[in-house]
Amino acid sequence: QSSLTPLMVNGILGESVTLPLEFPAGEKVNFITWLFNETSLAFIVPHETKSPEIHVTNPKQGKRLNFTQSYSLQLSNLKMEDTGSYRAQISTKTSAKLSSYTLRILRQLRNIQVTNHSQLFQNMTCELHLTCSVEDADDNVSFRWEALGNTLSSQPNLTVSWDPRISSEQDYTCIAENAVSNLSFSVSAQKLCEDVKIQYTDTKM
């Protein structure tokens, strides 16, 4: 990947990722330097007859670093702080080839929940105010609410009226997605409105 346009690589928090390295064809490599945010990460001297010399220069990531046979960088047990710019410099007798990468770490979505603040009007219409959330949501998480295949909201929140006299039983599903995972959670309008109705009758008595 040329230094002008870094290859963007997605990693999943806690899992492993490989930054692929392509060798100049037919040239003998003298050494390879891997950098993270312009700080040296590792220095590798390949040998034709024996194992390569690998000098890990960043102790912070050192124990989680590995290299493939082609000296691609493997980073395991990914942490959010691994996000950033990586560069590999391959030095041959005649040239130096630079490969650039941008690593971003994404979380697998976890613990989807729906909170409900619904109210019943005197005409027995039930107004549902639903809010969907996932653990540690960031700006890369997309939320939407669906019913019968139609998108009713493109946000974590859904406001919708439901009239039990004219509407059949209806499920509302929140879908949370990012580039590496998706979760969904369904709620029944009938059930939610029955709960509100019980509360409503209790307060009236």
Epitope: T102, R104, R144, S154, P156, T159
Partner: antibody, heavy 118, light 106 residues
Framework: QIQLVQSGSELKKPGASVKVSCKAS????????MNWVRQAPGQGLEWMGW????????RYADDFKGRFVFSLDKSVSTAYLQISSLKAEDTAVYYC???????????WGQGTTVTVSS | QIVLSQSPATLSLSPGERATLSCRAS?????MHWYQQKPGQAPRPWIY???NLASGIPARFSGSGSGTDYTLTISSLEPEDFAVYYC?????????FGGGTKVEIK
């Protein structure tokens, strides 16, 4: 039917401010995020950011942090884009666009041309 | 940010010909959306989530792809198809658009 209607063209001097409106109709305004997209003359589309129409919370793309402000008036189902300290390079067509989910913009305003010239 | 590169920048074809528009992402994305824009008009939604045609879009249009490579195909160009087409990704903020492919009459 569902539509977004934007305010008319604006001619402003450098350093001035402008406020573009986007009035939504035909759907529940607070259920769908509103995005803003810029198109400079002869150029492509640039996503500026979006505003959560339920909470009123805006999110800006890095290039649009500072002089650009998204706001709402839920009572009239309208989203606003305000640009302060206008520069010549702000000359563009500004679009509002509804997010139908997964940041798919299924309904667009007709666009508002903002020209900044001394 | 994820950079979307559209190719070719301009496609010169005659009505009835097949058009293949490419959109390459600098990182893997889950889905791609496509929009059509004609001069002096707002963009129109064309294809969402890689392969689903927006309402009223004729079946001669199709979308495909995964990972970093996505394609919009027009099986047989009609006069009204000559326009600029933009791809857009949603997997990562900021939501980015490609630079556009102009389909023009040869």
């Amino acid at each position: 039917q569902i539509q977004l209607v934007q305010s008319g063209s604006e001619l402003k001097k450098p350093g001035a401010s402008v406020k573009v409106s986007c009035k939504a109709s035909g759907y529940t305004f607070t259920n769908y995020g509103m995005n803003w997209v810029r198109q400079a003359p002869g150029q492509g589309l640039e996503w500026m950011g979006w505003i959560n129409t339920y909470s009123g919370e805006p999110r800006y793309a890095d290039d649009f942090k500072g002089r650009f402000v998204f706001s709402l008036d839920k009572s009239v189902s309208t989203a606003y884009l305000q640009i302060s300290s206008l520069k010549a390079e702000d000359t563009a067509v500004y679009y509002c666009a509804r997010d139908y989910g997964r940041w798919y913009f299924d309904v667009w305003g007709q666009g508002t041309t903002v020209t900044v010239s001394s | 940010q994820i950079v979307l590169s559209q190719s070719p920048a301009t496609l010169s074809l005659s009505p009835g010909e097949r058009a293949t528009l490419s959109c390459r992402a600098s990182s893997s994305v889950s889905h791609m959306h496509w929009y059509q824009q004609k001069p002096g008009q707002a963009p129109r939604p064309w294809i969402y989530a890689t392969s689903n045609l927006a309402s009223g879009i004729p079946a001669r249009f199709s979308g495909s792809g995964s990972g970093t490579d996505y394609t919009l195909t027009i099986s047989s160009l009609e006069p009204e198809d000559f326009a600029v087409y933009y791809c857009q990704q949603w997997s990562s903020t900021p939501r980015t658009f490609g630079g556009g492919t102009k389909v023009e009459i040869k």
